[in-house]
């Protein structure tokens, strides 16, 4: 995992970094849950999707998210976080044509319908953390991560090395 200075160095050039190709290098369909095993779910309400963080009932089916992995031209400084020495970015899509977006003004995570090429707000730097967890850092706002706040996803500013491994920005990916 990273110390905070590592993250800052790693992400300082994010505003300038471009995706190597407009096509993802690979994709993975997974359920997304928090460090504390709460599920991230998506509900269609009034023609828009809402994102929830909740405990599922036993045998209740988990929602899946398509993670699309892109190579950035910006080099990776941590093994396991990149491919061929390049940093990995991801987009997250729970259903066709909808992607998670970072709303930096509102410090919120939202689902928007859009066409490719996707805006920078849909890209997140993937960090492999301890205990098979990952975290997602905003491409548009280095040092800001997707996190959990009041049973919703929110954008959380990480300003110290202790906070980098705090549970509310750690997520688990699983196929089930």
């Amino acid at each position: 995992a990273f110390g905070i200075s590592g993250v800052q160095k790693y992400t300082r050039a994010l505003h300038d970094s471009s995706i190597t190709g407009i096509s993802p290098i690979t994709e993975y369909l997974a359920s997304l849950s928090t460090y504390n095993d709460q599920s991230i779910t998506f509900a269609l309400e009034d023609e828009s999707y809402e994102i929830y963080v909740e405990d599922l009932k036993k045998d209740e089916k988990k929602d899946k998210v398509l993670l699309s992995y892109y190579e950035s031209q910006h080099p990776s400084n941590e093994s396991g976080d990149g491919v061929d020495g390049k940093m990995l970015m991801v987009t997250l899509s729970p259903t066709k044509d909808f992607w998670l977006h970072a709303n930096n003004k509102e410090h919120s995570v939202e689902l928007h319908k859009c066409e490719k090429p996707l805006p920078d707000q849909a890209f997140f730097v993937l960090h492999n953390m301890h205990s098979n967890c990952v975290s997602f850092e905003c491409k548009t706002d280095p040092g800001v991560f997707i996190g959990v706040k009041d049973n919703h996803l929110a954008l959380i500013k990480v300003d110290s090395s202790e906070n980098l491994c705090t549970e509310n920005i750690l997520f688990k990916l699983s196929e089930t």
Partner: antibody
Framework: ELQLQESGPGLVKPSETLSLTCTVS??????????WGWIRQPPGKGLEWIGS???????YYNPALKSRVTISVDTSKNQFSLMLTSVTAADTAVYYC????????????????????WGQGTTVTVSS | EIVLTQSPGTLSLSPGERATLSCRAS???????LAWYQQKPGQAPRLLIY???SRATGIPDRFSGSGSGTDFTLTISRLEPEDFAVYYC?????????FGGGTKVEIK
């Protein structure tokens, strides 16, 4: 540097089972975001995808071969394997293992693949 | 399944010349999920291009890919001696993935 190496018998009798193993070095099957797969090339002909697998064991097969193919993974050995049953002379080919990028199609809810790192290939002849 | 037709079957050119290889799909696909491979005799294929236009790691910039829908092109801007080989296109827009029949680029 990631390397893949195929191994297995070069000669298989008709109606028997072809078994090949791919050993991955220079990287872990388990930690990869990629998939793994098998492709074959009959003598003087083009390429045919056989199937792919994720380290979790989830498999994806070519429908034309699905009834005869099993692909499995052993993360402890950093290997994945191919079994092709009831072989005939038409299964004579160079067999390649490869790392694959998997891309999802929302319309058919299926994955398809391209191969970015290949093994050197192993020739398998089906003959009595 | 999607059928890919490559043309020409053989391309005879001299080093330094420009090579243009065509790959046509039987059905249109919107994703541009098309790859190009190079294969030399006795060797495994090598990925050149993915996503129709993205160069794979370590591939020289004389190789470029373009196209969408049903028509895709691989261009080698100036042929080097090591570029004479067979080239395959492959779609991965939908399963099963399929390959074209190949174009052989030979020395004139």
């Amino acid at each position: 540097e990631l390397q893949l190496q195929e191994s297995g018998p070069g000669l298989v009798k008709p109606s028997e089972t072809l078994s090949l193993t791919c050993t991955v070095s220079g990287g872990s099957i388990r930690s990869s975001i990629f998939y793994w797969g098998w492709i074959r090339q009959p003598p003087g002909k083009g390429l045919e995808w056989i199937g792919s697998i994720y380290y979790s064991g989830r498999t994806y097969y070519n429908p034309a071969l699905k009834s005869r193919v099993t692909i499995s993974v052993d993360t402890s050995k950093n290997q994945f394997s191919l079994m092709l049953t009831s072989v005939t002379a038409a299964d004579t080919a160079v067999y390649y293992c490869a790392r694959a990028g998997g891309l999802y199609n929302w319309n058919d809810e299926s994955f398809s693949f391209y191969m970015d790192v290949w093994g050197q290939g192993t020739t398998v002849t089906v003959s009595s | 399944e999607i059928v890919l037709t490559q043309s020409p079957g053989t391309l005879s050119l001299s080093p330094g010349e420009r090579a243009t290889l065509s790959c046509r799909a039987s059905q249109s696909f919107s994703s541009s999920y098309l790859a190009w491979y190079q294969q030399k005799p006795g060797q495994a294929p090598r990925l050149l291009i993915y996503g129709a236009s993205s160069r794979a790691t370590g591939i020289p910039d004389r190789f470029s890919g373009s196209g969408s829908g049903t028509d895709f092109t691989l261009t080698i801007s100036r042929l080097e001696p090591e570029d004479f080989a067979v080239y395959y296109c492959q779609q991965y827009d939908r399963s099963p993935l399929t390959f074209g029949g190949g174009t052989k680029v030979e020395i004139k």
